[in-house]
Interface confidence: medium
């Protein structure tokens, strides 16, 4: 990359960092320049939890931080376009009785959509403690996308692995039956939502990550962009999480892990999510950053401005 372009990127990042403090609404762009010139950070600062080796199942080339906060939190290495809060039109509600034509949903990469559906199905299978066959997965993918099955399965496996810590394991090398291996050490997060069931609890760390990476507040659109990557859509129930709206704007808020507030002076009104008091009490920005780094197969240095902020918070707290 030409030298001039690098310095422009650095300047832009400085401006963005300053804006973060006041606006907190932009999606951070983690650039090659940032990663190349990130200060070297040692994991000992925060207890050595960060791993510098790529998380299993994450594509290692190119190994750099994802482009959007949502992609970073979901452990997705490709750039996703912003979908907004109404990114998907599901099936008509069972009780709907309109005799009107339905709206067309905004275009979305059908493979991403299918991998989201597959993640939902696999989580359901995990929840009911059942193994899964290739045939069952092919049914979810459908005939039209059969030829893309390996790619869809790869995407779904990555999502399962990095967000929920579940690995799909072939029962035997040539077999078509898979079981789940739970590879997450829960000690880091055992106090977080300890009374909740496994998959719902595992959504919290990435959600806190999306908020942190978006300058400590994330709009509903940014939150939904992240959830869409996991096959969780606004206005459509999920087989594992139930009603996503309730999960994020009610349960997590009621438990004081998130705050949900109107963006001051926004017209038309927009709403944003912030960390709640319990999130600050039970985890830290550094822990969340280490989680995101693990998810993305990198180190907290891949997010230099956020790493600095997390370090400052640790110092303030006297860690």
């Amino acid at each position: 990359m030409p030298r001039g372009q690098k310095s422009k990127l650095r300047a832009r990042e400085k401006r963005r960092k300053a804006r973060d403090e006041t606006r907190g609404l932009n999606v951070p762009q983690v650039t090659e320049a940032e990663e190349e010139e990130a200060p070297c950070c040692s994991s000992s600062v925060s207890g050595g939890a960060a791993s510098s080796s790529p998380a299993a199942g994450i594509p290692q080339e190119p190994q750099r931080a994802p482009t959007t906060a949502a992609a970073a939190a979901a452990g997705v290495s490709s750039t996703k376009s912003k979908k907004g809060a109404k990114s998907h039109q599901g099936e008509k509600n069972a009780s709907s009785s309109q005799a009107s034509t339905s709206t067309k949903s905004p275009s979305e990469d059908p493979l991403t959509r299918k991998s989201g559906s597959l993640v939902q199905f696999l989580l359901y299978k995990y929840k009911i403690k059942k193994s899964v066959t290739k045939g069952e997965m092919l049914k979810i993918v459908g005939k039209r996308f059969r030829e893309h099955f390996p790619e869809i399965l790869k995407k779904a496996s990555e999502g399962l692995s990095v967000v929920f810590g579940l690995e799909l394991n072939k029962v035997n090398p040539n077999g078509h039956t898979y079981t789940f291996i739970d590879k997450v050490d829960l000690t880091d997060e055992e106090s977080l939502l300890s009374s909740w069931d496994f998959p719902r609890r595992k959504l919290l760390m990435p959600l806190l990550g999306v908020i942190f990476l978006n300058g400590n507040s994330a709009t509903e659109e940014e939150i939904w962009e992240f959830l869409n990557m996991l096959g969780v859509y606004d206005g459509e129930e999920h087989s594992v999480f139930g009603e996503p709206w309730k999960l994020i704007t009610k349960d997590l808020v009621q438990e004081k892990y998130l705050e949900y507030k109107q963006v001051p002076s926004s017209d038309p009104p927009r709403f944003q999510f912030l960390w709640g008091p319990r999130a600050y009490a039970e985890t830290s920005k550094m822990k969340v950053l280490e989680f995101l780094a693990k998810v993305n197969g990198t180190t907290p240095c891949a997010f230099p401005t956020h790493y600095e902020e997390a370090l400052k918070d640790e110092e303030k707290a006297g860690v």
């Epitope: 009780s95 129930e237 139930g242 109107q262």
Partner: antibody
Framework: QSLEESGGGLVQPEGSLTLTCTAS????????ICWVRQAPGKGLEWIAC???????TYYANWAKGRFTISKTSSTTVTLQMTSLTAADTATYFC????????WGPGTLVTVSS | DIVMTQTPASVEAAVGGTVTIKCQAS??????LAWYQQKPGQPPSLLIY???TLASGIPSRVKGSGSGTQFTLTISDLECADAATYYC??????????????FGGGTEVVVK
């Protein structure tokens, strides 16, 4: 997926009745279930909700004391009604809220001597 | 309890026309407002939630707007099938410490 109300019918003034809302095709655990009623030719009136994730219950001010909402199994929620009067005559709906609503067809409760 | 005041109680419009229904909350409810359509003998059916988000399968000629205490439902390019009663509903919003869930009085839409 569906919800169905049962237990409606004719009841004497000052009598009691328990309505049941049964979910098919899903469990109630992650949802609110609410009871709403509609008197003949009138508008919708909220009675109570239960958050099945934690068992918290919420009531309209006018319903407190006479109506009790409770989760009786992973697929059923009941509404107990006491000291009924003619003004309670209505179709009673149970509904799953909010952004993914599902309503039952309703059950008619007639309070009359 | 929060009180939802819906106006008008009844409105008549021609096919292809537009109707506007207003709903006022007795206190601020943020964007925690839904609009429902109900036809005789049927349960209500969701049109809009979170004040302006279209429910699945609802055409873009249906529009919700507003926040705080003032909300509006606008249906343009009216069709005969739009003849029904419309209700606004405030629902529990996490930015509030108290639970609320209340309906407006309803607006009957007659399509000529």
């Amino acid at each position: 997926q569906s919800l169905e109300e049962s237990g409606g019918g004719l009841v004497q003034p000052e009598g009691s009745l328990t309505l049941t809302c049964t979910a098919s095709g899903f469990t109630l655990n992650n949802y609110y279930i609410c009871w709403v009623r509609q008197a003949p030719g009138k508008g919708l009136e909220w009675i109570a909700c239960i958050d099945n994730a934690n068992g918290r219950t919420y009531y309209a001010n006018w319903a407190k004391g006479r109506f009790t909402i409770s989760k009786t199994s992973s697929t059923t929620v009941t509404l107990q009604m006491t000291s009924l009067t003619a003004a309670d005559t209505a179709t009673y709906f149970c509904a799953r809220s909010l952004a993914t609503p599902l309503w039952g067809p309703g059950t008619l409760v007639t309070v009359s001597s | 309890d929060i009180v939802m005041t819906q106006t008008p109680a009844s409105v008549e419009a021609a096919v292809g026309g537009t109707v506007t229904i207003k709903c006022q909350a007795s206190e601020s409810i943020g964007n925690a407002l839904a609009w429902y359509q109900q036809k005789p003998g049927q349960p209500p059916s969701l049109l809009i939630y979170r004040a302006s988000t279209l429910a699945s399968g609802i055409p873009s000629r249906v529009k919700g707007s507003g926040s705080g205490t003032q909300f509006t439902l606008t249906i343009s390019d009216l069709e005969c099938a739009d003849a029904a009663t419309y209700y606004c509903q405030s629902y529990d919003d996490s930015s509030s410490s108290s639970f609320f869930y209340a309906f407006g009085g309803g607006t009957e839409v007659v399509v000529k």
